[in-house]
């Protein structure tokens, strides 16, 4: 296993609709044709997998149908979007990139993006 640099933004604020987007960029050391991207969430020293996708270079990123993540790839850059976030989902979201094929296998883990989610205030009942 060889190490690889990964960069991502330090902080992102989710939209009022609970959507957060960020870029994950990796320093590809060679001609990888198969790449796996995983988003991990770290909160209270617990790390859980949020979503993962494997893609072939030049093809779209495909997450499972029930995934809360969507994404697009462009070269060694992945644009990730996480949906359905609530305030309780605030945490550090870490981008993990693996170059699966051809060998050698490379692994890169970013420093994480702190995503802040603020639940919208419910609208007060209005009397007309």
């Amino acid at each position: 296993c060889k190490a690889m640099h990964v960069a991502q933004p330090a902080v992102v604020l989710a939209s009022s609709r609970g959507i957060a987007s960020f870029v994950c960029e990796y320093a590809s050391p060679g001609k990888a044709t198969e790449v796996r991207v995983t988003v991990l969430r770290q909160a209270d020293s617990q790390v859980t997998e949020v979503c993962a996708a494997t893609y072939m270079m030049g093809n779209e990123l495909t997450f499972l149908d029930d995934s809360i993540c969507t994404g697009t790839s462009s070269g060694n850059q992945v644009n990730l979007t996480i949906q359905g976030l609530r305030a309780m989902d605030t945490g550090l979201y870490i981008c993990k990139v693996e170059l699966m094929y051809p060998p050698p296998y490379y692994l890169g883990i970013g420093n994480g993006t702190q995503i802040y989610v603020i639940d919208p205030e419910p609208c007060p009942d209005s009397d007309f």
């Epitope: 640099h5 590809s28 001609k31 070269g75």
Partner: nanobody
């Protein structure tokens, strides 16, 4: 749109040195990571070096590490490849390529670059 033009190639003796330049005649290069590649006759294109947008991150394959150095001058819109102790096997057409990135990293994979120059010929021979 960024357009790349390589220069600085030529005939050099074994053990000699060259400095190649990659200049942009379109957009400013500072939003782009830049890579250098070469293609020798009858061989696949080979990665040589890359440099991130700010110049703080560079990467090289083991085959040229210590002999080739990539630098950039964003004020001059130019990326350089300094090559020393050249060998006959360094002969080929040298290309620079650019990729617009958000952060400071770069890639050694030709698959990641979408803009390429026309190339400059380097011949190492006595």
């Amino acid at each position: 749109q960024v357009q790349l033009v390589e220069s600085g190639g030529g005939l050099v003796q074994p053990g000699g040195s060259l400095r190649l330049s990659c200049a942009s005649s379109g957009d400013t290069l500072e939003s782009f990571a830049v890579g250098w590649f070469r293609q020798a006759p009858g061989k696949e294109r080979e990665e040589l070096a890359c440099i991130g947008r700010t110049g703080e991150f560079t990467d090289y394959p083991g085959s040229v590490k210590g002999r080739f150095t990539i630098t950039r001058d964003n004020a001059k819109n130019t990326v350089y490849l300094e090559m020393v102790n050249l060998k006959a096997e360094d002969t080929g057409v040298y290309y620079c390529a650019a990729e617009r990135l958000v952060f400071h990293l770069c890639s050694l994979s030709e698959y990641d670059y979408d803009t390429w120059g026309q190339g400059t010929q380097v011949t190492v021979s006595s």
